[in-house]
């Protein structure tokens, strides 16, 4: 899915109102020094691509994130504010249903959610390289058409 035409401001509002708090709850009890972010993103569509991948694609050692509250709210926000996103997720939903039902918080999952928090930070405030536009919103606005 190409996230270029999503309504980024609406997704940001959804993240800040609820998703961010669910991520903090998931990470509660984890030391803030524990994980170093290794996944990065360069602009808002790229950030959403990485966020989708880490949230919904099972990885070795962490197969259950898609059933977490923050994941369900992320999916809802993308479905509402990214035109055509829902249609691309039918197969992914089937795969999700086949994933194991129990929610197990492993260290690998905690690390993955720490990465997600970092990706969301960059989504909320993209930091473009200096040689590019010094105005991070202009970079988005060139491609960005609001869909309500």
């Amino acid at each position: 899915y190409d996230f270029t035409n999503c309504d980024f401001e609406k997704i940001k509002a959804a993240y800040l109102s609820t998703i961010s708090k669910d991520l903090i709850t998931y990470m509660s009890g984890t030391k803030s020094t524990e994980f170093n972010n290794t996944v990065s993103c360069s602009n808002r569509p790229h950030c959403l691509t990485e966020i989708q991948s880490l949230t919904f694609n099972p990885t070795a050692g962490c197969a259950s994130l898609a059933k977490e509250m923050f994941a369900m709210k992320t999916k809802a926000a993308l479905a509402i504010w990214c035109p055509g996103y829902s249609e691309t997720q039918i197969n992914a939903t089937q795969a999700m249903k086949k994933a194991r039902k129990s929610k197990v918080t492993t260290n690998k999952c905690l690390e993955q959610v720490s990465q997600l928090q970092g990706l969301w930070r960059r989504f909320n405030r993209p930091l473009l390289k200096q040689q590019g536009s010094s105005d991070y919103k202009d970079d988005d606005d060139k491609h960005h058409h609001h869909h309500h």
């Epitope: 509002a13 803030s32 020094t33 930070r121 909320n124 405030r125 200096q130």
Partner: antibody
Framework: EVQLVQSGAEVKKPGSSVKVSCKAS????????IEWVRQAPGQGLEWIGV????????NYNENFKGRATLTADKSTSTAYMELSSLRSEDTAVYYC????????????WGQGTTVTVSS | SIVMTQSPDSLAVSLGERATINCKAS??????VTWYQQKPGQSPKLLIY???NHYTGVPDRFSGSGSGTDFTLTISSLQAEDVAVYYC?????????FGQGTKLEIK
Amino acid sequence: EVQLVQSGAEVKKPGSSVKVSCKASGYAFSNYLIEWVRQAPGQGLEWIGVIDPGNGDTNYNENFKGRATLTADKSTSTAYMELSSLRSEDTAVYYCAREDNTGTAFDYWGQGTTVTVSS
Amino acid sequence: SIVMTQSPDSLAVSLGERATINCKASQSVSSDVTWYQQKPGQSPKLLIYYVSNHYTGVPDRFSGSGSGTDFTLTISSLQAEDVAVYYCQQHHRFPLTFGQGTKLEIK
């Protein structure tokens, strides 16, 4: 506990340079942007620029471009702000600050470093 | 650059009364506004982010509202420890910019 500890006060001559350090502790240094802000005596806050310690990416206020240089040393969890070609109007308290967990604010600030430029 | 203009420059309010500080952006900043409190000789402290979200530990008497170009910080019942300078900031576009500050005193 998250802490940002800055280097001590500096007195500099016009035309010289100053390098202020900001040592971070209590969190994963590479994961959060470090912002630099200054405050002239009796004045408001002015944003200088920002660095991503994870990859060295920066963004500067045009007012400081060419004079301010932001760097970060991951091995010591320390960010630096160097300002060159100093003039009297650069006399100010310089602050480093960390972005918050959502990327939309500065939640932890250093104690500030007073830089005085005087001949 | 986006100019953030606060009003009033200074404000004197009686203890227990409501204090209201306004911030106007020279162009729309969506909801990308933060409020900070700075007491004499101290570093700024985060109060409110993304217009209306309380930072951890900030008392409920502080609240933020607005969108687009007009924003407000309200202290519902002024306490002695609220004497400070308050700054709004936009992070919608680089360069990030602050308002000039509003000095809040006890009447």
